[in-house]
């Protein structure tokens, strides 16, 4: 039994990081296979990570995490048995994947102006509270071409669009997403979607 | 939020103990370390330990090596630290303060008197 | 004693810039991370800077950290006469077993 595909990982950076690889042919993860983790630090206590598949020969884990703080640094050993397959390290905060955000609701009633809100994913305590910029991505349920993304580059989880910059009469769906730069994070998942219909008084022709 | 609220004030002779108790609330109490540190008056800051209140392991300055035991209990969200054989030098306010690399919370502080 | 040395005092006038160093050694400042905590008149001491350049949620931008080898500095900017205080940097020493060490403090007096 062979690692294919070493581990790769990434970190939410508040309680889970998610650790992804290879076998070089069918295995059954969580039987088979663990991964250990833990903390280069004093007093640190190692933890056991049971993976389960991801396709035939691939498995992935999830690692819980206490007090998730950019110092931290993991050591990572997978084991078949006695086994030692690999041995590595995973530094959460260079490998940041975002939280998604929550909680996205079109507000259509403010004279002709939609406003959307969500929830910021993360507790005011984490570093990313204050750093997460968003993706707002607005699209036509009838005109696959009306596609459009909206950057929200301040820290308020809100955007303010004119309801006349979409067509009247149809409905749409937006979701979000968010990154942070500070630690060159990817993008999150997109959060599920939400659904309205678009109505606005044209104005009247002179 | 997270609050650390330690007990109050004591006054002790030489010779004596101290018991130091700093309740936690506003999060996942095993999820965090606990420091403690001194500050005796008109001096700085002196760091005495450290406890993992998850498994309760410790490690302790050498200056405090066999005399300080810290310890917690989970019930309660509660950690502890015990200084014997007191001195008058041990007169200081006794702070905890939560984090791993830094300390990124801290109680009030505690005033410890010794006297005789 | 400590292992990390401080200025005893520094002073400015409000609005002006301020600096405090930290100089450690390679078992300390030069092979972790770096803290520091602000200590007003007969409160707790509070965090102010980690991991050597950020500030805690709440922190203005006007005070900063940096690092380079074994010594770290805070800086202060547009100084106000609530920033009056004891300064305290902090980092962990591994020179014997593990320790973390502050610094010998830092009177600060707002001119």
């Known amino acids: 039994m062979k690692v294919l595909q070493e581990p790769t990982c990434v970190s939410d950076y508040m309680s889970i990081s998610t650790c992804e690889w290879k076998m070089n042919g069918p295995t059954n993860c969580s039987t088979e296979l663990r991964l250990l983790y833990q903390l280069v630090f004093l007093l640190s206590e190692a933890h056991t990570c049971i993976p389960e598949n991801n396709g035939g020969a691939g498995c992935v884990c999830h690692l819980l995490m206490d007090d998730v703080v950019s110092a931290d640094n993991y050591t990572l050993d997978l084991w078949a048995g006695q086994q030692l397959l690999w041995k590595g390290s995973f530094k959460p905060s260079e490998h940041v994947k975002p939280r998604a955000p929550g909680n996205l609701t079109v507000h259509t009633n403010v004279s002709d102006t939609l406003l959307l809100t969500w929830s910021n994913p993360y507790p005011p305590d984490n570093y990313l509270y204050n750093h997460l910029t968003y993706a707002v991505n607005i699209w036509s349920e009838n005109d696959p071409a009306d596609f459009r993304i909206y950057n929200v580059t301040y820290l308020e989880p809100s955007l303010r669009i004119a309801a006349s910059t979409l067509k009247s009469g149809i409905s749409y769906r937006a979701r979000v997403r968010a990154w942070a730069q500070c630690y060159n994070t990817t993008w999150s998942e997109w959060s599920p979607s939400t659904k309205w219909h678009n109505s606005y008084r044209e104005p009247f022709e002179q | 939020q997270v609050q650390l609220v330690q007990s109050g004030a004591e006054v002790k002779k030489p010779g004596a103990s101290v018991k130091v108790s700093c309740k936690a609330s506003?999060?996942?109490?095993?999820?965090?370390?606990m420091h403690w540190a001194r500050q005796a008056p008109g001096q700085g800051l002196e760091w005495m330990g450290i406890?993992?209140?998850?498994?309760?392991?410790?490690s302790y300055a050498q200056k405090f090596q066999g005399r300080v035991t810290m310890t917690r209990d989970t019930s309660t969200s509660t950690v502890y630290m015990e200084l014997s054989s007191l001195r008058s030098e041990d007169t200081a306010v006794y702070y905890c303060?939560?984090?791993?690399?830094?300390?990124?919370?801290w109680g009030k502080g505690t005033l410890v008197t010794v006297s005789s | 004693q400590s292992v990390l040395t401080q200025p005893p005092s520094v002073s400015a006038a409000p609005g002006q810039k301020v600096t405090i160093s930290c100089s450690g050694g390679?078992?300390?400042?030069?092979?972790?991370?770096v803290s520091w905590y602000q200590q007003l008149p007969g409160t707790a001491p509070k965090l102010l800077i980690y991991?050597?350049?950020k500030r805690p949620s709440g922190i203005p931008d006007r005070f900063s950290g940096s690092k380079s080898g074994t010594s770290a500095t805070l800086a202060i900017t547009g100084l106000q006469t609530g920033d009056e205080a004891d300064y305290y940097c902090?980092?962990?020493?591994?020179?014997?077993?593990?320790?973390?060490?502050f610094g010998t403090g830092t009177k600060l007096t707002v001119l």
């Open positions: 303060a939560r984090g791993k690399w830094w300390l990124d919370y």
């Open positions: 506003g999060y996942a109490f095993t999820s965090y370390y």
């Open positions: 406890i993992n209140p998850s498994g309760g392991s410790t």
């Open positions: 390679s078992s300390n400042i030069g092979n972790s991370y």
């Open positions: 991991d050597n350049n």
């Open positions: 902090g980092t962990w020493d591994t020179s014997l077993s593990a320790n973390y060490v």
